[in-house]
Interface confidence: low
C-alpha cells in the first residue's frame, strides 16, 4: 500500500510568496508621478514578479512631528484621494495582489511614534485599523517599534483587532533591532505577528555565520511562521555587495517563511550608484530615462526594461525564484534541514511528504569551493540522493536540468545552486 499523504497545513495568503514594499511612491514611480492612480499602472509589473502582497506607504496625512496634524484616516492629498485608494484596492484584488498599509504614524518626523504622546497615538492607530479594515485592506505594517513604549502589549491589542476582523488579515511589525532576544520578546506575546528586523543584516560575511543565524532563529521561534529580509525597510544593496545579491535572493526565497523585499531589490537598485539619491528611497530605474541627472550614469542593464530582456539578469532570477516559491509544496510549507557542506558554505534541504524536494547550496566566499555534503546531519526522512537535477544557478554557464553528482559538487565564488530531486520511499 502507498504511504498515506501528510495532511497539508493551513496556508494563509502571505505564506504563498513574497511581499513587496513600496515605502516611497514618488521614488518608486519616478518621472514626476508618485500617486495612487499612477501606482495602479504598475500593478501588472508587480504581477510579473509573482509577489503576493504590496506593503504600501505610509500615505496618511502627517505634519512632521505634529501629532494633532497627523491623521491616520486621511490620505495625504499628494498621494491621491480615498477614491484613488479604493480603485487601487479593486485593481490589486483583480490581480490577486493583497494590499498592506503602513500606518507608522510620524513617518516624516524624528520619532516615528511621538514618544511623549504614546497613548494618543495608540488610540489613533486602533481607530485607523478599524477604518481601513472596513475599507478593504489586507493588513497593516508598523515600523520602528523599538521606539514604541510597551510595544508588545500594543501589538497584541492591534493584532486582536486585525485577526478579530478576519483571520485572513496580516499585521507586520518592523524593528531596526538585530538582537535575537529583543526580537523574541516582541514575538512572545504575538503569535501570528510577522516581524521584519535587521537580524540578518550582518550575515554577509561567511556561510557558517549565515547558517548559524538562520538555524538559531528557526530553533528559537519553533514552528511559528516567520519572515525573511535584511531590514524593515531598506534595500538589499544597503547591506550587500553586488556579488552577493543573487545568493541572497536564492536564500530568501527558499528559507521557510515569507520573503520580504523592497522595491528595486529585484534589479539590484543601488542608491550609491545614483549620486544625490537618498539611500533609503532612491528613484526606481524603469529605464535609462529614470535618472537623467548624470548622463550615462544608468546603463540598460541596471533598469527594469533592460533586465526584462535579459534571461540572465537579476530580475529574471527573481521572477524564476518567485514563481518556484509560489508553486512548489516543498518551498511553500516544507520542512527545513540545514547540514554541513564545508567551510564557507551554507546548505539546506526543503521537503514536504512525497513531493519534489529541493537542495540549496550557497557559497558566500570569494573562492571556488568543493562541497562536501554531510548527509549524516540529516534525518532519515530527508536523505540525499547521489544525484540531483540543477534547477538553477545564480551564475551563468551551467546547463540547467542536468543531473549533478552531489559528491563532486563544485561551486564558483558567490555561487548558489538550487537543485531538485524526487521523493524516494
Amino acid at each position: 500500500r502507498a504511504p498515506r499523504c501528510r495532511e497539508l497545513p493551513a496556508q494563509k495568503w502571505w505564506h504563498t510568496g513574497a511581499l513587496y514594499r513600496i515605502g516611497d511612491l514618488q521614488a518608486f514611480q519616478g518621472h514626476g508621478a508618485g500617486n495612487l492612480a499612477g501606482l495602479k499602472g504598475r500593478l501588472d509589473y508587480l504581477s510579473s514578479l509573482k509577489v503576493k502582497g504590496l506593503v504600501l506607504g505610509p500615505i496618511h496625512k502627517n505634519q512632521k512631528d505634529d501629532v494633532a496634524q497627523t491623521d491616520l484616516l486621511q490620505i495625504d492629498p499628494n498621494f491621491g484621494s480615498k477614491e484613488d485608494f479604493d480603485s487601487l484596492l479593486q485593481s490589486a484584488k483583480k490581480k490577486s495582489i493583497r494590499v498592506i498599509l503602513d500606518l507608522t504614524p510620524n513617518y516624516r518626523g524624528e520619532n516615528s511614534w511621538f514618544s511623549t504622546q504614546v497613548d494618543t497615538v495608540a488610540t489613533k492607530v486602533k481607530d485607523a485599523l478599524e477604518f481601513w479594515l472596513q475599507a478593504g485592506v489586507d493588513g497593516f505594517q508598523v515600523r520602528d517599534i523599538e521606539n514604541l513604549k510597551d510595544a508588545s502589549s500594543f501589538l497584541a491589542e492591534w493584532q486582536n483587532i486585525t485577526k478579530g476582523f478576519s483571520e485572513d488579515r496580516l499585521l507586520i511589525a518592523g524593528t531596526n533591532s538585530s538582537d535575537l532576544q529583543q526580537i523574541l520578546s516582541l514575538l512572545e506575546s504575538n503569535k501570528d505577528l510577522l516581524l521584519t528586523s535587521s537580524y540578518l543584516s550582518d550575515s554577509g560575511s561567511t556561510g557558517e555565520h549565515t547558517k548559524s543565524l538562520v538555524t538559531q532563529y528557526l530553533n528559537a521561534t519553533g514552528n511559528r511562521w516567520c519572515s525573511w529580509s535584511l531590514s524593515q525597510a531598506r534595500l538589499l544593496t544597503s547591506f550587500l555587495p553586488a556579488q552577493l545579491l543573487r545568493l541572497y535572493q536564492l536564500m530568501l526565497f527558499t528559507l521557510p517563511g515569507t520573503p520580504v523585499f523592497s522595491y528595486g531589490d529585484e534589479i539590484g537598485l543601488d542608491a550609491a550608484a545614483l549620486p544625490g539619491q537618498p539611500m533609503e528611497a532612491p528613484v526606481m530605474l524603469w529605464d535609462e530615462s529614470s535618472f537623467p541627472d548624470i548622463p550615462g550614469a544608468v546603463s540598460a542593464n541596471m533598469t527594469v526594461k533592460g533586465q526584462s530582456e535579459d534571461p540572465g539578469s537579476l530580475l529574471s532570477l527573481f521572477r524564476r525564484l518567485s514563481d518556484q516559491r509560489s508553486k512548489e509544496r516543498s518551498l511553500l510549507h516544507g520542512d527545513f534541514h540545514a547540514f554541513s557542506a564545508g567551510p564557507g558554505l551554507f546548505s539546506y534541504i526543503r521537503h514536504w511528504d512525497q513531493n519534489e524536494r529541493f537542495l540549496v547550496v550557497l557559497n558566500f566566499g570569494d573562492v571556488g569551493l568543493s562541497a562536501g555534503l554531510q548527509a549524516s546531519d540529516l534525518p532519515a526522512s530527508a536523505s540525499l540522493p547521489a544525484k540531483a537535477d540543477l534547477l538553477l544557478s545564480t551564475q551563468p554557464g551551467r546547463e540547467e536540468g542536468s543531473p549533478l553528482e552531489l559528491e563532486r559538487l563544485k561551486l564558483e565564488p558567490h555561487e548558489g545552486l538550487l537543485l531538485r530531486f524526487p521523493y524516494a520511499a
Epitope: Q26, Q29, G30, G32
Partner: antibody
C-alpha cells in the same frame, strides 16, 4: 477642476528666443510630469519632451534637443518651454499636457500658445 | 523612431452611423496607444489613455481596440459633436510619436 493655463500668443523676429509658460491648478503639481507638444500645419503633432515636475529631470525628442529647454518652478506650479534661435519653421502652436505616469499618455492639455516667427 | 500611420486622412459619416478609425505602428507598441480628439481652434482632448481604457467622462460610444501594431478607434452612433480630428499616439517608447490625424466629416 484641472487647468493648464498657457501664456498668450507671441509674434517674434527670427533669431531671437521665446519662453512660454503653463500654469497648473486644480491638482498637486508635482504628482504629474509635463509634456510639451508642437502642432504645425506641415507636421501635425510632434512631441518635444517631458519634464518631471518633482525631480526636474527631462527627456527630449532628439529633434528638439538644441531648440527647446523645459524647466519648472514648483513654487508657482508652472512649467516653462524656451525656444531658441527661432526660424519660420518654429511657427506653430505649442501645448503643455500633463501625464501621471511614465507609461501613460497625456490626459489634460493646455489651451496652446501660438508662436509666429516673422521679420 | 516609431512611425504611427493613420492611412485615412479624411472619413465621411452620417449622424447615427458607426465609424472605425485605424492607426498602424511601425513596430510592436504593446497596448501603449492613446487617442485624442481635436476640434478646430481647440486643444486635443484625451479619449483613450491606454488601449482600451476610456478617459474619465468620455462617452461609451468611443471604444478602442488593438495591441502590437494595429489599433482602431470605433465611434458608434456618431453625433454631430464628434466631427473633429482624431489622432493616435504611441507612448511605448521615446520619442513619443503621433499619427497624422483623421478628420471626421459629414457626408
Amino acid at each position: 477642476q484641472v487647468q493648464l493655463q498657457q501664456s498668450g500668443a507671441e509674434l517674434v523676429r527670427p533669431g531671437v528666443s521665446v519662453k512660454i509658460s503653463c500654469k497648473a491648478s486644480g491638482y498637486t503639481f508635482t504628482d504629474y510630469a509635463m509634456h510639451w507638444v508642437k502642432q504645425s500645419h506641415a507636421k501635425s503633432l510632434e512631441w518635444i519632451g517631458v519634464i518631471s515636475t518633482y525631480y526636474g529631470d527631462t527627456t527630449y525628442n532628439q529633434k528638439f534637443k538644441d531648440k527647446a529647454t523645459m524647466t519648472v518652478d514648483k513654487s508657482s506650479s508652472t512649467a516653462y518651454l524656451e525656444l531658441a534661435r527661432l526660424t519660420s519653421e518654429d511657427s506653430a502652436i505649442y501645448y503643455c499636457a500633463r501625464v501621471w505616469l511614465l507609461s501613460y499618455a497625456m490626459d489634460n492639455w493646455g489651451q496652446g500658445t501660438s508662436v509666429t516667427v516673422s521679420s | 523612431d516609431i512611425v504611427m500611420t493613420q492611412s485615412q486622412r479624411f472619413m465621411s459619416t452620417s449622424v447615427g452611423d458607426g465609424v472605425r478609425i485605424t492607426c498602424k505602428a511601425s513596430q510592436n507598441v504593446r497596448t501603449a496607444v492613446a487617442w485624442y480628439q481635436q476640434k478646430p481652434g481647440q486643444s486635443p482632448k484625451a479619449l483613450i489613455n491606454l488601449a482600451p481604457n476610456r478617459h474619465t467622462g468620455v462617452p461609451d460610444r468611443f471604444t478602442a481596440r488593438g495591441s502590437g501594431t494595429d489599433f482602431t478607434l470605433t465611434i458608434s452612433n456618431v453625433q454631430s459633436e464628434d466631427l473633429a480630428d482624431y489622432f493616435c499616439l504611441q507612448h511605448w517608447n521615446y520619442p513619443l510619436t503621433f499619427g497624422a490625424g483623421t478628420k471626421l466629416e459629414l457626408k
